[in-house]
Interface confidence: medium
């Protein structure tokens, strides 16, 4: 801790301005009043303080606000935010989206730090749910944000917020997360017509059940292979060759390149070879002609 020393004559700060960058750490401690700093926080970020000087300013704020900073100060922290620990941030009550944006801007271009993760957690918990504006903001700064949430956390996302989600925001989502997001997307986009609906729902299809894939196959959607490869294996397996052909349209030819990868590999193993042959792609590994195909789920139900 910086020891208390008297402020030299004529150096008492009357505003937060550039002259302070020439103050030594002990002079900042002695000559900058905490109340002055707090009421002029919006000026700090425009001044190129050193990291050591920022430590002194943080120390002054910590003394003034031992229970945590008020939002009027948090909003103007600027680069001082980088000095905050997750423990500091847990004391805050951040309710304004403008405050959140201001702090995310400071960390822009960097990985999500523990400080930012704590800040977002405090903000979302304070709001009670991930509303559209918050989601818009978070995904703009961190495209992978949505996929960093647990299925439980995603369950608090209202369907209306799904409109804000871009395809790249879902790139790192796993099937469990898409299982939660897909029904919300379905609900959000349900009033759109066929082609528009498919454009919007496409990114979420990794959480779609078989029945919905069958329904899509009747709508001439021409799903690309990248989307098909992200579908749930258990949802793809029951699809017939004809349904997959309709689902993929002209992209069906891409199945050949993916025949050794899931879900295509597993799907091929479930199809009759003569049905696969109708595609004319040379797909191999289907059930040979004359073999009996048992529906194991039906067999279990009967026994």
């Amino acid at each position: 801790e910086v020891e208390k020393t008297a402020c030299p004559s004529g150096k008492k700060a009357r505003e937060i301005d550039e002259s302070l960058i020439f103050y030594k750490k002990w002079e900042l401690e002695a000559c900058v009043d905490a109340a002055l700093l707090a009421t002029q926080m919006d000026r700090v970020n425009a001044i190129p303080f050193t990291y050591e000087q920022l430590d002194v300013l943080k120390h002054k704020l910590d003394e003034l606000y031992p229970q945590g900073y008020p939002e009027s100060v948090i909003q103007h922290l600027g680069y001082l935010f980088l000095k905050m620990s997750p423990e500091d941030i847990r004391k805050w009550n951040v309710t304004s989206l403008e405050t959140l944006k201001a702090l995310l801007e400071v960390n822009k271009g960097h990985e999500m730090s523990p400080q930012v993760a704590t800040l977002i957690d405090r903000f979302v918990k304070g709001r009670g749910q991930l509303d559209k504006d918050t989601l818009d903001t978070l995904t703009a700064f961190y495209p992978g944000y949505l996929c960093s949430l647990s299925p439980e956390e995603l369950s608090s996302v209202p369907p209306s917020s799904i409109w804000a989600v871009r395809p790249q925001d879902l790139d790192t989502c796993d099937p469990r997360q898409l299982d939660v997001l897909y029904p919300k997307a379905r609900l959000a986009f349900q009033n759109m017509n066929g082609s528009e609906y498919f454009v919007k729902i496409q990114s979420f299809l990794g959480g779609a059940p078989t029945e919905d894939l069958k329904a899509l196959s009747q709508q001439n959607v021409s799903m690309d292979l990248a989307t098909f490869m992200k579908l749930r294996t258990d949802a793809v397996l029951p699809l017939t060759v004809a349904e997959v052909q309709k689902l993929l349209g002209p992209h069906v030819e891409g199945l050949k390149a993916e025949e050794r990868h899931r879900p295509v590999r597993d799907w091929i193993l479930r199809q009759r070879q003569d049905d696969l042959d109708t595609l004319g792609l040379g797909l191999q590994g289907g059930i040979p002609n004359g073999y009996l195909v048992l529906d194991l789920s039906m067999q279990e139900a009967l026994s």
Partner: antibody, heavy 119, light 112 residues
Framework: QVQLQESGPGLVKPSQTLSLTCTVS??????????WSWIRQHPGKGLEWIGY???????YYNPSLKSRVTISVDTSKNQFSLKLSSVTAADTAVYYC???????????WGQGTLVTVSS | DIVMTQTPLSLSVAPGQPASISCQSS???????????LYWYLQKPGQPPQLLIY???NRFSGVPDRFSGSGSGTDFTLKISRVEAEDVGIYYC?????????FGQGTKLEIK
């Protein structure tokens, strides 16, 4: 709606200490980062800022009055107070309390109380 | 301390006519953060001052749009596009660039 109300004696003798209290209603004095201020207005004259306090007790005073001013706060009563020592006739004024927001917006004011310094 | 000087000190305007008040500071009120810390207050007869304009040109909530502020550096202006009877009182400019905050001496607006 936040309301502020000044109270205290309207007449103080020279060399004594002027004491005023401002009671805040309709909001907490320890609310989001607000500072609480005293401003005075000499009869027929302009406004002079005296100083401000945060609910934790941290203060900032106008250097011209600093040697004579003390501002204190009582969060349990939602009040803050002004003491001005060694008063003279030049301290006769209407004293206002006001809420100070970021960037120095004095957004809520009391109605003001006239203090006369006279023997 | 920063000294604030207002002109004119009094003004008499007919209802519906425009009014303009100038305020000059002894030092620039612009900070390197881009903000300029100049405020306008109106004190109606028998009342405390009320905030009209903050940071040169931003109207405070509930302030009619006939009030506008402009200026930069050391020279600032408050304009009332069409004066109404309720606008009478004393107008003060105030700076908070540097503590202590300081007020202009006031401009008294009367209705003709």
């Amino acid at each position: 709606q936040v309301q502020l109300q000044e109270s205290g004696p309207g007449l103080v003798k020279p060399s004594q200490t002027l004491s005023l209290t401002c009671t805040v209603s309709g909001g907490s004095i320890s609310g989001d980062g607000h500072f609480w201020s005293w401003i005075r207005q000499h009869p027929g004259k302009g406004l002079e800022w005296i100083g401000y306090i945060y609910y934790s007790g941290s203060t900032y005073y106008n250097p011209s009055l600093k040697s004579r001013v003390t501002i204190s706060v009582d969060t349990s009563k939602n009040q803050f107070s002004l003491k001005l020592s060694s008063v003279t006739a030049a301290d006769t004024a209407v004293y206002y309390c006001a809420r100070l927001r970021g960037g120095y917006k004095f957004d809520y004011w009391g109605q003001g109380t006239l203090v006369t310094v006279s023997s | 301390d920063i000294v604030m000087t207002q002109t004119p000190l009094s003004l008499s305007v007919a209802p519906g006519q425009p009014a303009s008040i100038s305020c000059q500071s002894s030092l620039s009120l612009q900070h390197s953060n881009g903000k300029t810390y100049l405020y306008w207050y109106l004190q109606k007869p028998g009342q405390p001052p009320q905030l009209l304009i903050y940071e040169v040109s931003n109207r405070f909530s509930g302030v009619p749009d006939r009030f506008s502020g402009s200026g930069s550096g050391t020279d600032f202006t408050l304009k009332i596009s069409r004066v109404e009877a309720e606008d009478v009182g004393i107008y003060y400019c105030m700076q908070s660039k540097q503590l202590p905050c300081s007020f202009g001496q006031g401009t008294k607006l009367e209705i003709k």
